[in-house]
Amino acid sequence: MKVTGIFLLSALALLSLSGNTGADSLGREAKCYNELNGCTKIYDPVCGTDGNTYPNECVLCFENRKRQTSILIQKSGPC
């Protein structure tokens, strides 16, 4: 019984952690695997959580590093 209780408490704790923490509702993190090699010039805009439009996901990654910010992607396409 005690083991089951601990398991249930752990499960609840995990659920609360993985629940809607605010960051998820704001947007998702930009995928930054290409940024080290330089960003493509292809215009595929994303809307940042700062309300600014970035020409592509890589550029948002670039700007987060360069400006030491943590801007997420609010949506695909321009703001």
Epitope: L36, K41, D50, P55
Partner: antibody
Framework: QSVKESEGGLFKPTDTLTLTCTVS????????ISWVRQAPGNGLEWIGR???????DYASWARSRSTITRDTNLNTVTLQMTSLTAADTATYFC?????????????WGPGTLVTVSS | AYDMTQTPASVSAAVGGTVTIKCQAS??????LSWLQQKPGQPPKLLIY???TLASGVPSRFKGSGSGTEFTLTISGVQCDDAATYYC????????????FGGGTEVVVK
Amino acid sequence: QSVKESEGGLFKPTDTLTLTCTVSGFSLSSYAISWVRQAPGNGLEWIGRINSGGATDYASWARSRSTITRDTNLNTVTLQMTSLTAADTATYFCAKEEYSYGGAYGMWGPGTLVTVSS
Amino acid sequence: AYDMTQTPASVSAAVGGTVTIKCQASESISTYLSWLQQKPGQPPKLLIYKASTLASGVPSRFKGSGSGTEFTLTISGVQCDDAATYYCQQDYTISNVGNVFGGGTEVVVK
């Protein structure tokens, strides 16, 4: 593609400097533009930048008296610097930041000379 | 604060010789470093980006190397046209920096 600064000129101490960088052949919505200056006989000094999204950043020494804005329709970026002193005498450059080059400044304007003297 | 220290301030080389310029970052900047060449009365010109990639039209006698905090620009087979001032520039961050450029190195060709 090109970037070019507006004419500088002679200013008095305490004046406000306004310079415009006009770009052609590319969109300000896809590139960052930086302002850099060079005092006579001295090295390059970064002033600040406006990125593709319109966010601005400034060198620590310039933050309190500099403002960078842009007009994506007119293809212009403007630098405004208040409370000029003789130490602001320099050639001012605007430069295009290349995201595909890891942020290097791949294109520079010819520069414009600003003299501050009473 | 990502300060860039460039050495030497000035260097003299004979035509055909080799010039080595060093640039040190106060903190790691990975390979986000570029080298610029400036001649009197002209704007700077991009030579090398990402520490070692030659910009378009730049002769192969220019070579950039390094990563982290230590970087080098080497000019092999120096020509008269290489007489200029060279600057390193960190492209890693502009957050809370005073300057992104090194102090410059004047190359005199004899």
